[in-house]
């Protein structure tokens, strides 16, 4: 039986079939038998035998064009309608629904607490780091270094509220201004958009899915960069968010309220606190330059403490220093004083799993961190299997039309903005914008949300976690009230402000082109998303922290050339794209510079060089774990193992094969791969890719 | 019990200087500070200075100051204290003594004193 | 230097009687302030520190008190073994100075 011809497009270039005489294929079973078997068997076919067959009369019924890659998948419903089963067959299907939700709901808590760990772990890995960023004395008169320690410490230790929290304290304390704190605030921001980039890693195995997923997820960073680069200037120039909350917190004669609700924690805390517990006072004291803070664990021992005013017998260092003359004594040598001491005795211990290990932070924070990224791992495959199982057919258009439907005209606007009070509702209830936004990415991921929703809920995401910050600042003690309700006011109108220059007029909603333009190198090169990570969240900011420290001169002689040669670029690129005739011939592409410097193609070809050997034994690890995973979800046999190993895909492009319409696969997974576009697998599909 | 053992008695001349020692016993000789007193005959006490053994850190009368060396050898937990340019008017039993109730100058073990007569 | 100025020098009293012994500090000293017993031939004994709290193994019958710069030794009931010098010595201030000291004998 010979195979399926290669019509899908007419090839007018018979020399492409005279590469490599032979290559396997599987055989295509007949087309109107539609069975579900598939037919492992497979012939070494010559190409060159299918010459004469060229014809632009396409042996498959429609004509397949390479669909949109952003265009949402049709979930399919392979199963048997509702109206179809007997009784049995729907008590087991709803029991089957229950246990569905219950699994999705039980890996949602476990992927909400290993975020909450993972964010412990990256304070005691990097925490105190992090502390001593701010106890850096250049901030007050450099806002981009303040930006960058902004980033850094919120990368760092996971978690925008710690950061900001240290900054409310140092700016309470009168360590730091206001407005030196405003640039720190804007690089918290752009910090905790770190969390659901990476939990959007998570989603590398499938390139369809991790286009949109990680093209959700950075839509999120874009927002914040680019809000930044226009922000930051506009502040520094005119100081309008200084000003403005400075107004707002001194028209208001507030009184400190009720703690903030804390909703999610409440539900999330009573696990987490199992497995760590955190003296977060220790990064503060750290940043306020503390030096018996940066001996003391940032591990919690003691949970239970009381807290004692006595009068103790102190050393001071001269007679000055006395509490008063008739208080001040000496034993010979050294002068002594009494002062009111506050004696910490310690009651209870806390009931964690480090308490009583006495682990260095270091090994602790490692442990937790690949614990934590384990079962965030877990729990996200987990729940996208599920949701892939729950969303078909009906239920899928149900929940794409609900959430992704415009109003009807002429209030179709009002869509987006309702979108942004729905992302800031829901990150005030989860307390979190990284927590919300990274549950966001993998519904982005398996298509159930568009970016261009997507976009207009992280932006409300960000709202909801400043109102967050709002009301803790309200419920703050008198000392801090008025400085970090002001730092909360900035950072909710900076986040305001951001909206009304990146979402109001469509043309302006950069963010979206910037992260799919991201989402389709990523998903071509997957190993530019942690390129990407690494150098807009670690190199840049520690490069530009490098050299802040040197002093400005040093920052202005090399962020000039840089920021001239980033415009030169962008606006030969626009000059390209829209008017190249204006260009000379030699400007008009990029093919003057070497390739290296403006394709990715050689990277990639170093790249795999190195990754090579370890594709392999990952591979193998990744079909076992697969296989385990498919057999304890009931998944059909093959379930989506193929994903793993792309050998045959990225083998078939490198050997220039075009890529195949989907009926001429055998194996559906791998059809839907090269094409750009996944499927949840067909439940009857009874695939061999193991 | 705690015990401070002093040297023998001294007969210097004027301008000689006279090193006396102090060694200790029945409790931890880093733990508390050593004082040396002296009492001219018929006369009353007069504080000379004072040693923290755990970390030599001294204090001095300023009427001795420049004249007087507290030191502390913690191998052998003994003090030991030297006077130069000695005059008439520095003939004393002097006594070296501790306080062992923390934070205050108050001594509560003395030595039997070291009879130091200046004479030419 | 703060001075420390004991009155009166010396003193003599009956088996039984209340003995009085004051002390002036040039300066307030608040309550730094130490007494101390010395018999002939013998070396000095702390009996009392922080102005009125007894030292270990030291009878009731001593007591002081006071505070700033006027500071008072009571023996409530002279016995014979108390016939010694007397010294005050005040701690607020390097240096440590001591009192002239106040002889005390029996009648």
């Known amino acids: 039986m010979a195979p399926w011809p290669e019509l899908g497009d007419a090839q007018p270039n018979p020399s492409k079939y005279l590469e490599g005489a032979t290559s396997q294929q599987p055989i295509t079973p007949d087309k109107s038998k539609e069975t579900n078997k598939t037919d492992n068997t497979e012939v070494p076919v010559t190409k060159f035998e299918l010459l004469p067959t060229y014809s632009t009369a396409t042996l498959i019924e429609e004509p397949t064009e390479v669909d949109d890659p952003w265009n949402l998948p049709t979930l399919q419903d392979s199963g048997i309608k509702w109206s179809e089963r007997d009784a049995k067959g729907k008590i087991l299907c709803v029991f089957q629904g229950i246990g569905r939700l219950i699994l999705l709901l039980g890996f949602l808590y476990f992927f909400v607490c290993s975020l909450d760990v993972l964010s412990s772990a990256f304070q005691l890995v990097g925490g105190k780091m992090a502390g001593q960023f701010f106890s850096n004395s250049s901030i007050m008169s450099n806002p981009l270094l303040g930006l960058v320690i902004g980033v850094l410490v919120t990368v760092f230790v996971q978690s925008s509220s710690t950061s900001t929290s240290i900054v409310v304290s140092m700016v309470a304390s009168s360590l730091l201004t206001v407005r030196a704190a405003i640039p720190i605030i804007m690089g918290a921001n752009i910090g905790t958009s770190i969390t659901n980039t990476i939990v959007a890693l998570m989603q590398v195995g499938d390139r369809s899915e991790f286009r949109r997923a990680f093209a959700g997820a950075t839509v999120h960073d874009f927002f914040n960069w680019l809000s930044v680069l226009v922000l930051l200037p506009v502040e520094v120039a005119t100081h309008y968010l200084e000003v403005v909350t400075q107004l707002i917190v001194e028209s208001f004669h507030f009184k400190n309220g009720e703690d903030a609700p804390d909703l999610l924690k409440v539900i999330t805390k009573p696990f987490t606190k199992l497995i760590v517990q955190l003296d977060k006072k220790v990064i503060s004291q750290i940043a306020m330059n503390d030096e018996t803070a940066k001996n003391k664990s940032l591990v919690k021992i003691w949970c239970k403490t009381f807290t004692n005013m006595t009068q103790m017998n102190v050393t001071v260092p001269s007679m000055a220093n006395c509490t008063s003359p008739s208080l001040c004594w000496t034993d010979g040598i050294q002068i002594w004083t009494m002062k009111n001491v506050t004696y910490k005795e310690n009651i209870a211990k806390c009931q964690h799993i480090f308490v009583n290990f006495h682990l260095p932070d270091l090994a602790v924070g490692i442990i937790l961190l690949i614990i934590s990224l384990l079962v965030l791992c877990g729990c996200l495959i987990m729940i996208v299997k599920i949701l892939g199982s729950v969303l078909k057919g009906q239920v899928a258009t149900v929940i794409k039309k609900t959430i992704n439907t415009d109003f009807p005209f002429p209030f179709a606007w009002l869509t987006g903005y309702l979108a942004i009070l729905v992302g800031a509702g829901m990150t005030f209830i989860v307390q979190s914008s990284s927590v919300f936004t990274s549950a966001l990415t993998p519904l982005i991921g398996i298509g159930v949300i568009t970016i261009e929703r997507a976009y207009p809920l992280t932006l409300g995401s960000n709202i909801g976690t400043t109102t967050t910050a709002i009301l803790a600042a309200l419920a703050s003690p008198g000392n801090t009230l008025r400085s970090s309700l002001q730092i909360a006011l900035c950072h909710f109108f900076f986040n305001i402000s951001g909206i009304l220059l990146w979402y109001p007029i469509p043309f302006t909603r950069l963010p979206i082109r910037m992260a799919k333009g991201l989402g389709n190198i990523s998903a071509k090169y997957r190993w530019f998303a942690i390129f990407y990570l690494i150098i807009f969240f670690f190199l840049i900011p520690l490069t530009v922290f490098g050299l802040s420290l040197a002093g400005w001169p040093v920052l202005v002689g090399v962020g000039v050339p840089v920021v001239f040669i980033i415009i030169l670029v962008l606006c030969l690129r626009l000059l390209q794209s829209r008017c190249p005739r204006v260009l000379p011939k030699k400007l008009q592409n990029w093919n003057f510079l070497p390739l290296c410097m403006h394709s990715l193609k050689p990277w990639d070809a170093v790249i795999s060089k190195f990754t090579g050997p370890f594709q392999m034994p990952c591979c193998c690890c990744c079909r076992v774990c697969c296989r385990v995973c498919c057999l304890l979800c009931g998944c059909p046999k093959c379930c989506r193992c193929s994903k793993c190993c792309q050998d045959l895909e990225e083998g078939q492009e490198a050997q220039g094969v075009p890529v195949k319409a989907p009926e001429t696969f055998d194996n559906i997974t791998i059809s839907r791969e090269a094409q750009g576009e996944v499927r949840a697998p067909d439940s009857k599909t009874e695939c061999t890719a193991l | 019990q705690v015990q401070l053992v002093q040297s023998g008695a001294e007969v210097v001349k004027p301008g000689a200087s006279v090193k006396m020692s102090c060694k200790t016993s029945?409790?931890?000789?880093?733990?508390?500070?050593m004082h040396w007193v002296r009492q001219a005959p018929g006369q009353g006490l007069e504080w000379i200075g004072a040693i923290y053994p755990g970390s030599g850190d001294t204090s001095y009368n300023q009427k001795f100051k420049g004249r007087v060396t507290l030191t502390a050898d913690k191998s052998t937990s003994t003090a030991y204290m030297e006077l130069s340019s000695l005059r008439s008017e520095d003939t004393a039993v002097y006594y070296c003594?501790?306080?062992?109730?923390?934070?205050?100058?108050?001594?509560?073990?003395w030595g039997q004193g070291t009879l130091v007569t200046v004479s030419s | 230097d703060i001075q420390m100025t004991q009155s009166p020098s010396s003193l003599s009293a009956s088996v039984g009687d209340r003995v009085t012994i004051t002390c002036k500090a040039s300066?307030?000293?608040?309550?730094?302030v130490a007494w101390y017993q010395q018999k002939p031939g013998k070396v000095p004994k702390l009996l009392i520190y922080?102005?009125?709290t007894r030292h270990t193994g030291v009878p009731s019958r001593f007591s002081g008190s006071g505070s700033g710069t006027d500071f008072t030794l009571t023996i409530s009931s002279l016995q014979p073994e108390d016939v010694a010098t007397y010294y005050c010595q005040q701690y607020s201030r390097i240096p440590l100075t001591f009192g002239g000291g106040t002889k005390v004998e029996i009648k």
């Open positions: 029945g409790y931890t000789f880093i733990t508390y500070n």
């Open positions: 300066q307030d000293v608040g309550t730094a």
């Open positions: 003594s501790i306080s062992t109730i923390i934070t205050t100058g108050a001594v509560d073990y």
């Open positions: 922080w102005t009125s």
